[in-house]
Interface confidence: low
């Protein structure tokens, strides 16, 4: 047998919110379940649909939801059916509708002393409770001669007298929520003793010293009183005029002229109507004083052939809100066709090279007129003057690579060197007209190099090898004054380089040839056993076919190069105590001696009364302090070489003898005894 | 009669694991979605996750306290759900229940009508 | 996540009192709202579904109503039996989440 385990049950549902109508079944074959809305198929919708077997609701409906559910289970083998209780929405919900007049039949059958009724058309389930307003002000039971009654829709005015005239709208609540009246009832009730309006004053701009006028006209029986105010409620009359409204006249049809507008004439006028009987009628209008700001200046804009392109005139501040326009050589520009206006912006559709030049934006009020010019260049692709060429630079000259283009704005040129964008350095520099100069062409600068000139418009680029001339030159060049160890073998190099290679080969100043012993092997000079003869000054000479010869004159020097004969040595010293660094060189020629001390040469005219150099080159220091303490450096030196040697120099304190020890206590260390 | 056991529960250090199941009994375990929920001592009631039916591919979904940690599954054959849990922390120390809405997979729709007895689980040092 | 609040936390009734309980959605829930009764030591069990709808076999003096973001659980006349504690459910979106509960006891 089908069991229902679950039944759907009848329930409050709120209109438009979610619901959900429980049905399980339990059955010991496949059941097939589906739902029945008073007694027809219910089909899924995205609104209404089943989930599981129970329906689920996305958004109740009070009408497509009305009416009796039923879950229906169904075993499709065995044919049995089951059925469920009936269930049902009890649907809350409110609606909008109109305030409209219920009697008399029409607007026109309203005269004073008549009965007025008024329906409120929001409906509502539960029924709701209304609340009546006029003027956006509740009315109560009784209240001014009307009947209220809060739980109908019906408002009642009887007798209908011109108090009643105003705006009249209702809201209601129930259950559900609240509503207020989707269109409202103006009321009016004529009493000819109450001030109407006739003609109302309009918001007005005027330019300063212009004149402005404003129209206010009232009627009523017996004729109404008519009064203009000014901001501060100061009165306005042809008799008492404010000292700022010296220039306003007050015409008998009640309107009110201001001449010579200044800035403290702008505000708000009140225009006042009192009839017999009534309120008086407040009628309110503000003059403003025309204004125009600057407009912001353009950039000069670059654009490119057939392209389309827009520029935006940004308008000025301005009251009355400025009308803007453009212009071009003077004439003012269609609002279609290629070139045109659209809005506030200039719209180039398929830019041509005709186009280039100065566009007008203008803005115009009442308070004046702005204009603001914008250059427009259009852009093309440059052009060859002069293309780079492979050229033969001369090594240690300045060299030149042309790249001259033209084109609208003036191209920008940038130099590539094997690929590597060139940056202007001290030795390459580019010039307005794209040329690219190297100065001091070296060996290395033969290579590629590339042009490239673009605009927004495109670029067009070149490239040219450069191949760089040699100078004939030394690699290196001789050091002009040379040493060589007496007794001992020496070599003297020199080599060259050229367009072609160059020939090398030495000889003596004098033009004397070369001793035997000495020989001269493809540049380097070799000496076997030098001599003091072989002193003197030697010329190498470099040359070949295209560049001719070089020479380079080297002076030689034969040379006993410094050993020390006494080294300083590691000395320790009694402060106030005397310290003695000996040092002594030998060498041809005779070597001098300096003397460096904690890392400065001391030198011998500013030592001062406690250092000496002696002529051996020993070095003494008297009165020795804690802070002579430190390394000192022997530095002998000749015109061909130069050796140092250092020790390091102790000060300390002289101890006081202990009565363990015996007055012919060694110290206990190395002392110079002074 | 309708029966869900879980077993597994015990001691275990905090960083360590543990893997709790549930028995199903009594009704179609196969269509039906398996939820867990934990009560620590003294505490409410907290859901942790569920596991929806074959025909809604095994979806899982998981409170965000405890996503990335725990992970459940079923076995159809079996009538069995489990819950692994790993890097367990001490704060995860409760009696862990297994429940069901019995009749349907739909687990948004659900109320919870078939309990566990609940199995303790002790995250300790 | 959606917050239940439920309040008051506890509180303590003389048989025949009307007990009263309210649980606040953090937004609108529409009626997916269930009530459950857990008895010290035993695993919960549902009293109302759907925000208002009594479960099969439990005693009419249980009753709940609310829609949206407001729900009510109330007890007509409080019986020695009811002590508990009373929690709230949403699961109109996961994840699945419970009021803090309401302990109920006997004066």
């Known amino acids: 047998a089908i069991v229902f385990i679950k039944q759907p049950s009848s329930q409050d549902a709120l209109q438009g919110r979610r619901a959900l109508l429980r049905c399980e079944v339990e059955a010991p074959g496949l059941v097939h379940v589906y739902w029945l809305l008073d007694g027809a198929p219910v089909q899924d919708t995205e609104r209404r649909f089943t989930q599981g077997s129970s329906l689920s609701f996305a958004a109740v409906d009070r009408l497509q939801d009305s009416g009796t559910f039923q879950c229906v289970a169904r075993d499709d083998v065995t044919g049995e059916e089951a059925r469920s209780a009936n269930a049902s929405f009890n649907i809350k919900w409110i609606e909008a509708g109109p305030v409209v007049l219920k009697h008399p039949a029409s607007e026109a059958e309203i005269q004073p002393q008549t009965q007025v009724t008024l329906r409120c058309h929001i409906d509502g389930h539960p029924r709701p409770t209304y609340q009546w307003f006029r003027d956006g002000t509740p009315l109560s039971d009784g209240q001014s001669n009307n009947t209220v009654s809060s739980k109908e829709r019906n408002l009642t005015l009887r007798p209908a007298g011109p108090e009643h005239s105003g705006l009249y709208s209702c809201c209601a609540h129930n259950a559900f929520g609240q509503a207020c009246s989707s269109q409202n009832f103006t009321l009016s009730i004529a009493d000819e003793s109450f001030a109407r309006v006739v003609l109302a004053p309009q918001d007005v701009i005027v330019a300063r010293n212009e004149e402005a006028m404003f129209h206010c006209q009232f009627s009523a029986q017996p004729p109404p009183n008519l009064q203009w105010l000014f901001e501060d409620e100061t009165p306005i009359t042809n008799r008492s005029r404010p000292p700022h409204l010296r220039r306003a006249t007050v015409f008998a049809n009640g309107s009110l002229l201001l001449t010579q507008v200044r800035p403290r004439n702008a505000g708000v006028y009140r225009c006042i109507g009192q009839g017999q009987r009534g309120p008086p009628v407040i009628l309110e209008a503000t003059l403003h004083l025309a204004e125009i700001e600057d407009m912001p200046l353009f950039e000069p804009r670059v654009f490119t052939a057939g392209s389309e392109e827009r520029v935006t005139c940004l308008p000025p501040k301005g009251l009355p809100e400025p009308s803007v326009w453009w212009e071009h050589a003077g004439v003012r520009l269609p609002t279609h066709g290629r070139v045109y206006q659209k809005g506030h912006e200039l719209v180039l559709a398929s830019i041509a090279e005709s186009d280039a030049g100065v566009y007008t934006c203008h803005a115009a009020n009442l308070a004046g007129q702005r204009r603001q010019d914008v250059n427009i260049t259009v852009a093309t692709v440059p052009t060859w003057l002069k293309k780079p060429q492979d050229s033969q630079l001369e090594e240690g000259k300045p060299g030149y690579l042309h790249c001259l283009t033209q084109a609208t704005p003036k191209p920008t040129v940038v130099w590539y060197r094997n690929q590597m964008l060139i940056s202007e350095d001290s030795r390459f520099e580019v010039f307005k007209n794209g040329t690219l100069r190297i100065n001091n062409v070296e060996v290395y600068d033969g290579t590629w190099y590339r042009c490239v000139s673009s605009t927004p418009a495109g670029s067009i680029e070149a490239q040219a090898r450069v191949q760089v001339l040699e100078k004939l030159k030394f690699t290196p060049p001789p050091q002009p004054q040379q040493c060589m160890e007496f007794d001992k073998e020496a070599t003297v190099p020199c080599s060259a380089t050229g367009r072609e290679k160059p020939t090398i080969k030495w000889e003596r100043a004098d033009g004397s040839s070369l001793p035997e012993w000495v020989t001269d092997n493809a540049g380097t000079l070799h000496f076997a056993r030098v001599t003091r003869d072989d002193a003197g000054n030697y010329t190498c000479i470099a040359s070949n076919g295209p560049q001719g010869q070089i020479r380079a004159h080297v002076q030689l020097t034969v040379a006993v190069f410094i050993t020390f004969k006494v080294e300083p040595e590691r000395t320790t010293v009694y402060q106030g105590h005397t310290a003695l660094l000996q040092c002594e060189a030998q060498g041809d020629p005779k070597p001098l001696i300096q003397w460096k001390g904690k890392d400065r040469i001391l030198d011998p005219t500013k030592l001062g009364p406690r250092m000496h150099i002696f002529q051996n080159g020993s070095l003494v220091i008297h009165d020795v302090a804690p802070e002579d303490s430190g390394r000192y450096t022997c530095i002998a030196g000749n015109s061909c070489n130069i050796k140092h040697t250092e020790a390091p120099l102790y000060v300390v304190d002289k101890p006081v003898p202990e009565e363990s020890e015996g007055p012919g206590s060694p110290p206990p260390y190395k002392m110079i005894q002074t | 009669e309708v029966q869900l056991v879980e077993s597994g529960g015990g001691l275990v250090q905090p960083g360590g694991s543990l893997k709790l199941s549930c028995a199903a009994s009594?009704?179609?375990?196969?269509?039906?979605?398996m939820h867990w929920v934990r009560q620590a001592s003294g505490k409410g009631l907290e859901w942790i996750g569920r596991?929806?039916?074959?025909?809604?591919?095994?979806?899982?979904s998981y409170d965000a306290s405890v996503k990335g940690r725990f992970t459940i599954s079923r076995n159809d054959s079996k009538n069995t759900a489990y819950l692994q849990m790993n890097s367990l922390k001490t704060e995860d120390t409760a009696v862990y229940y297994c429940?069901?809405?019995?009749?349907?997979?739909?687990?948004?729709?659900?109320?919870?009508?078939?309990w566990g007895q609940g199995t303790l689980v002790t995250v300790s040092s | 996540d959606i917050q239940m609040t439920q309040s008051p936390s506890s509180l303590s009734a003389s048989v025949g009192d009307r007990v009263t309980i309210t649980c606040q959605a953090s937004?609108?829930?529409?009626?997916?709202l269930n009530w459950y009764q857990q008895k010290p030591g035993k695993a919960p069990k549902v009293l109302i579904y759907?925000?208002?709808n009594l479960e099969k076999g439990v005693p009419s003096r249980f009753s709940g109503s609310g829609s949206g973001t407001d729900f009510t659980f109330t007890i007509s006349s409080l019986q020695p039996e009811d002590i508990g504690t009373y929690y709230c459910?949403?699961?109109?979106?996961?994840?699945?989440?419970f009021g803090g509960g309401t302990k109920v006891e006997i004066k």
């Open positions: 429940t069901s809405r019995g009749y349907s997979g739909y687990d948004y729709s659900s109320y919870f009508d078939y």
């Open positions: 009594g009704f179609t375990f196969s269509g039906s979605a």
């Open positions: 596991i929806r039916s074959k025909a809604n591919n095994d979806a899982t």
């Open positions: 937004q609108d829930i529409s009626n997916y």
């Open positions: 759907d925000a208002s």
């Open positions: 459910q949403q699961y109109d979106n996961l994840p699945i989440t």
